[in-house]
């Protein structure tokens, strides 16, 4: 689609005659007819294939033709055509006179003809133009003429529409030749495709308009490159999305069994040594002065029993006083004033003679202490068992009962429950203190990893571009299939864009 | 226990400017990403802005974008929404989640009110 | 952005009732669906993420399913704590967007 313009220039008819020959009266009042048709070696009569105009009465005999695009009188003249343009034309131009006001072929005697001019060859579409001269016996015209394509028409031919646009469906202006130029940071065919910020991950990221990374679900950060980790993950990272790796110090499925738990919480009080036991689980060695599980209660200086042969205990501020019974004397009423034949050894003790008869010494029983046999042995004052173990008397020797997930002696070893790998499969076992618990390697489910599941390939979303995902049962794999226009395992390349 | 605790919230003519504050704990704060989202009173929920873990990038809704800035501080803990420019339809809880635009919302705190009225 | 709709907009039920909240995405978001449970007054909670996992600690009557651009919670059997307004939200694309919320509601 295009547009045929004519400038007339100059008519020259200085005598004022009509082709006959025969004078205008009062004079030559002047008006052109064009006829655009398509190329004829001869050009004859007949319809104007490419279109035809009329202009109003220019001047009188010889006149110039001024510029001029409003009013009645259009100069150029314009003949718009809705085909591709052939490069060839013939253009016939007549200049009549009007006796009257009426211009109609019908109303015009024949002999009003006052010239003819007939031309034809090549024109290129271009905004030059092309500057002719057509002489005859008495008169003269100059004119210009050139093709121009329509608003949004390109090319050679003006065959190509083009209408730059700014919205949904493109970001583009037109070049002359109808080509599309990509407003900044569009590209693609019809320039829908926006540009990302520089570096965002090919994969991972997205963009909806120019200098933008919009991250695909399970990635995050400025270039989409760093994982999500999974929602229930406490104290984890990931290398993959929804991933959860435990930070040193913490363990579980979803990293919240506290492995350090004496760094995290420092359970154990008044200047107590804390040794980590497994999940959770601690022990504190208490100061000199302090006891209980955190080592939170602080002991009276009468709690060591520190005074002997029946003495009575009594705290003070800067320590301790015994009162002592009949017959004993000391700090810690140590010193007897009996003998042997006072009967002094309690609880079946026996008395040895000592310095002369000037004291004694008794020999206790098993299960008794003290200088005079009267202590019962408490096997269990010196917190022997570990890992929270109850520590019990049992006549001469003493006993320790373990909490569960520890055992020995003293309760000193921890009791693994993974120990006999009760995970099938190649599942990975974690002791918790409620039991042990299996992680299962994709394909297995179940208490033990003991149920083989058909492991859903296609959980993870790999297919791009809308493209429907399969699992393949016998391979565990996913299988992609593509829409139209998409290629690659996970349909990421539009057809015709190779991967780079 | 994961807990997020938020505060800054109150009344504020239109106009006017406030900094939400979202405290962290029970997780390791500096390797999740986090979010603000809000509730009008009586209407549902709307995403407000996410800020990645590690680099801190920040997306901000439509809505809001040039107005709200989402911020963190991985030492303290925190989490921040620095809002300028408030307009009556800003008016409602504001929660702090833990998650991201392109993720569930795994996490949420009590909800601070923000009142936008002269 | 995408449009999330949920049906229906209120329900009422009884305790052991089995429950079908819908919400349907006005185009495809594979399966990067989530819904939560909220009481008035307080935060919403996480019940379900990628369409049909249950989140930590959520009781297993809560299920999930559907893919693309339909999606179902279900409730097998009603529990008094579950009288709440459900929330589906999709984060497949840029912008996250909610569903406007069922309210279920004792019978």
């Known amino acids: 689609s295009g547009v045929f313009q004519l400038q007339l220039q100059e008519f020259v008819n200085e005598r004022g005659v009509l082709a006959s020959g025969r004078p205008c009266e009062p004079g030559c009042r002047t008006f052109f007819r064009v006829c655009l048709k398509h190329f004829q070696a001869v050009v004859s009569p007949g319809p104007c294939t490419f279109g035809s105009v009329s202009t109003p009465v220019l001047g009188t005999n010889s006149f110039a033709v001024r510029d001029d695009s409003s009013g009645g009188g259009r100069n150029p003249l314009q003949l718009p055509f809705n085909f591709t343009w052939p490069g060839t034309f013939s253009l016939i131009i007549e200049a009549w006179h009007a006796p009257g006001d009426d211009l109609r072929p019908e109303a015009l005697p024949p002999d009003a003809l006052i010239s003819k001019i007939a031309i034809q060859g090549s024109l290129a579409v271009g905004q030059n133009w092309l500057l002719d001269e057509q002489t005859s016996t008495l008169t003269r015209l100059r004119y210009s003429y050139r093709v121009i394509c329509s608003d949004n028409y390109y090319g050679d031919n003006c065959s190509r529409l083009c209408k730059k646009r700014n919205d949904h469906f493109g970001h583009y202006v037109c070049q002359p030749d109808g080509n599309l130029s990509c407003l900044p940071g569009w590209t693609g065919e019809y320039c829908q495709q926006p540009i990302c910020l520089s570096g965002c991950h090919e994969q991972n990221g997205y963009c909806s308009k120019p200098a933008e990374c919009l991250c695909r679900p399970g990635w995050q950060g400025r270039l989409c490159n760093e994982c999500i980790p999974h929602n229930g993950c406490r104290h984890g990272t990931c290398s993959t999305p929804w991933q959860c790796t435990c930070d040193e110090g913490w363990g579980g499925l979803f990293c919240d069994q506290d492995l350090n738990y004496c760094t995290h919480h420092s359970p154990c009080k008044n200047g107590a040594t804390c040794s980590n036991s497994g999940q959770r689980s601690y022990t504190c060695t208490c100061r000199p002065g302090y006891t209980g599980v955190d080592c939170e209660l602080e002991l009276s200086e009468c709690d060591s029993n520190p005074c002997r042969n029946g003495g009575s205990c009594k705290d003070q501020e800067d320590g301790y006083h015994c009162l002592c019974p009949p017959g004993y004397y000391g700090l810690h009423c140590e010193h007897s004033t009996l003998s042997c034949a006072d009967s002094p050894c309690f609880n079946g003790g026996s008395c040895r003679e000592r310095n002369q008869g000037a004291s004694y010494a008794c020999e206790c029983p098993p299960n008794f202490t003290g200088s005079n046999c009267e202590k019962k042995v408490d096997r269990c004052t010196s917190n022997p068992c570990a890992n929270g173990g109850q520590c019990l008397n049992r006549g001469p020797s003493r006993m320790c009962r373990c909490r569960p997930g520890f055992t020995g002696t003293y309760c000193e070893r921890h009791v693994s429950d993974c120990a006999r790998n009760p995970c099938a499969h190649g599942g990975t076992c974690h002791d918790l203190e409620s039991g042990l618990m299996c992680t299962c390697p994709a394909g297995f489910s179940g208490r033990r990893c003991e149920v083989r599941t058909s492991i859903d390939a296609c959980a993870s979303s790999p297919c791009f571009n809308r493209a429907t995902c399969y699992t393949d049962l016998s391979t565990d794999t996913f299988v992609c299939n593509c829409p139209y226009g998409f290629v690659g395992s996970r349909c990421e390349f539009p057809v015709g864009l190779p991967p780079s | 226990e994961v807990q997020l605790v938020e505060s800054g919230g109150g009344l504020v003519q239109p106009g006017g400017s406030l900094r939400l504050s979202c405290a962290a704990s029970?997780?390791?704060?500096?390797?999740?990403?986090m979010s603000w989202v809000r509730q009008a009173p009586g209407k549902g929920l709307e995403w407000v802005a996410s800020?990645?873990?590690?680099?801190?990038?920040?997306t901000i809704g439509d809505s809001v974008k040039g107005r709200f800035t989402i911020s963190r501080d991985n030492a303290k803990n925190s989490l921040y929404l620095q809002m300028n420019s408030l307009r009556a339809e800003d008016t409602a809880v504001y929660y702090c989640s833990r998650g991201y635009y392109n993720s569930p919302f795994a996490y949420w705190g009590q909800g601070t009110l923000v009142t936008v009225s002269s | 952005d995408i449009q999330m709709t949920q049906s229906p907009s209120s329900l009422s039920a009884s305790v052991g009732d089995r429950v079908t909240i819908t919400c349907r995405a006005s185009e495809d978001i594979y399966s990067n669906l989530a819904w939560y449970q909220q009481k008035p007054g307080k935060a919403p909670k996480l019940l379900i993420y990628d369409t049909n996992n249950l989140a930590d600690g959520v009781p297993s009557r809560f299920s999930g399913s559907g893919s693309g651009t339909d999606f179902t919670l279900t409730i097998s059997s009603l529990q008094p704590e579950d009288f709440a307004t459900y929330y589906c939200q999709q984060y497949n694309n840029y912008p996250p967007t909610f569903g406007q919320g069922t309210k279920l509601e004792i019978k």
């Open positions: 029970g997780f390791t704060f500096g390797n999740f990403p």
């Open positions: 800020i990645s873990s590690s680099d801190s990038w920040a």
